[in-house]
């Protein structure tokens, strides 16, 4: 898969990244930048809802590492701890959302690293004619929900959010120009894993089924 | 159970050295544990110096780094103190103790064993 | 390093009667604190850790309580043995640090 970048990254005042990772990439996530002769112990504390929270720890002293409540197979140190501190998501899954939290013991204090990962899922964009002058846009199984606009603007029906059990989203505008003498409108989809515009043809006649929609991006 | 007990000189002049003993009985300092030494000066203020771990690796309090030293003899399941260029504000009572790291090695840094401890003065 | 703050320094009572200590950190400590009873003659002894834990062999009447930076350890129906010096002790973080010591003496 891709190596996810940090390019959405954003630090809170109490030193906590809010970290969107796109779903199926992978992740790295840091420690603080402590230098290793000054350690005495590393833990990774992972905080899923709905799960035990679990530790992954490291014992420089005398090189030991310890588990406690974890089962995800894919969130492992990047590589052996006294190598590497950074832990890796491969790949990247819906349920890993969580707040992840790299915690540094010093003799000197401790020093601390938190994010919160929210998985990105790229929602799948679909557009059609469903009747004379209306056209319908779909933004399916998106994390987080999508927006839609329209340019031109027509008259639209309230935008419906349909939430599924996985944590996604699947977003539907329905417009009408009944009274617009636009030929092609365009459905614009807002989303964090980046944005995506398809254009139709509007038939003034009987109602079509599925006039297939062109792609802008 | 496990028992500590410090030994020491009791009376240091200014400006030497001294080395502080103690002794586990119950248990092997080779096994486990955190092994620490702590002092609680004249008036009650306590402070922790820094401690020696089963492996062998030591962790010192960074206020006093340069001036102190914790070893350890495992033939004779003993563990020692060595402060350098001590002067009068050194005099206390020294404890040596014992910590356990929990699962996480975070945190579970408090003393469920002590010994009960050595007076050492330091005047001329 | 954490600075910690106990207090009172001395504390009069009567058997029979119940008492409190606060201890303070100077920064969030979460719930890592523990209280100590110091007696002439004994080895120190570990009353409670993790803020409210009782170690094994601590009788019921102690009690800990707090979190964040505010911590109370409160003695319920005093026995005479409970006269001592009780200290509080941050384990959240090296260097470890102790508050400057209680004494509780007879009424």
């Known amino acids: 898969g891709k190596q996810m970048t940090q390019n959405y990254s954003k630090m809170s005042a109490e030193g906590n990244i809010s970290q969107p990772v796109l779903m199926d990439t992978n992740a790295n996530l840091c420690c603080p930048p402590i230098e290793f002769r000054n350690l005495i112990v590393i833990v990774w504390e992972i905080i899923i809802r709905g799960q035990p929270s679990c530790t992954k720890a490291y014992r420089k002293e005398t090189n030991e590492t310890k588990e406690t409540n974890c089962t995800d197979k894919r969130i492992t140190w990047v590589s052996t701890p006294d190598q590497n501190s950074d832990l890796q998501i491969h790949p990247v899954a819906i349920t890993h959302d969580g707040y992840y939290r790299c915690i540094m013991a010093t003799p000197d204090g401790n020093f601390h690293r938190g994010y919160h990962l929210q998985v990105l899922v790229t929602p799948e964009v679909t557009l059609f004619q469903s009747r004379n002058r209306t056209a319908v846009c779909k933004a399916v199984a998106g994390k987080p929900a999508a927006q839609i606009s329209w340019i031109p603007a027509g008259d639209c029906a309230p935008t419906e959010h349909e939430y599924w059990g996985n944590g996604t989203v699947t977003v539907e505008s329905m417009c009408h120009w009944g009274d617009h003498n636009a030929s092609t409108v365009t459905c614009h989809v807002s989303h964090l894993t980046g944005n995506k515009s398809l254009y139709i043809k509007l038939n003034s006649g009987l109602r079509t089924s599925g006039s297939p929609a062109l792609d802008l991006l | 159970e496990i028992q500590l007990q410090e030994s020491g000189p009791g009376l240091v002049k200014p400006s030497q050295s001294f080395s502080l003993t103690c002794s586990v009985t119950?248990?092997?300092?080779?096994?486990?544990?955190?092994w620490s030494w702590i002092r609680k000066f004249p008036g009650n203020r306590m402070e922790w110096m820094g401690y020696?771990?089963?492996?062998?690796?030591?962790v010192y309090n960074p206020s006093l780094r340069s001036r102190f030293s914790i070893t350890r003899d495992t033939s004779k399941n003993q563990f020692f103190l060595q402060l350098n260029s001590v002067a009068s504000e050194d005099t206390a009572t020294y404890y040596c103790?014992?910590?356990?790291?929990?699962?996480?090695?975070?945190?579970?840094?408090?003393?469920?064993?002590w010994g009960p401890g050595t007076m050492v003065t330091v005047s001329s | 390093d954490v600075q910690m703050t106990q207090s009172p320094s001395y504390l009069a009572a009567s058997p029979g009667e119940s008492v409190s200590i606060s201890c303070k950190a100077g920064k969030n400590i979460n719930t890592n604190l523990a209280w100590y009873q110091a007696k002439p003659g004994k080895t120190n002894k570990v009353l409670i850790h993790s803020g409210s834990t009782l170690q094994s062999g601590t009788p019921s009447r102690f009690s800990g309580s707090g979190f964040g930076t505010d911590f109370t350890l409160t003695i319920r129906s005093l026995e005479p043995e409970d006269f001592a010096v009780y200290y509080c002790q941050q384990h959240n973080e090296f260097p470890l640090t102790f508050g400057s010591g209680t004494k509780l003496e007879i009424k």
């Open positions: 119950g248990y092997t300092i080779t096994s486990g544990y955190d």
């Open positions: 020696i771990n089963y492996s062998g690796s030591t």
């Open positions: 103790a014992k910590f356990e790291a929990s699962n996480t090695y975070l945190y579970d840094w408090y003393f469920d064993f």
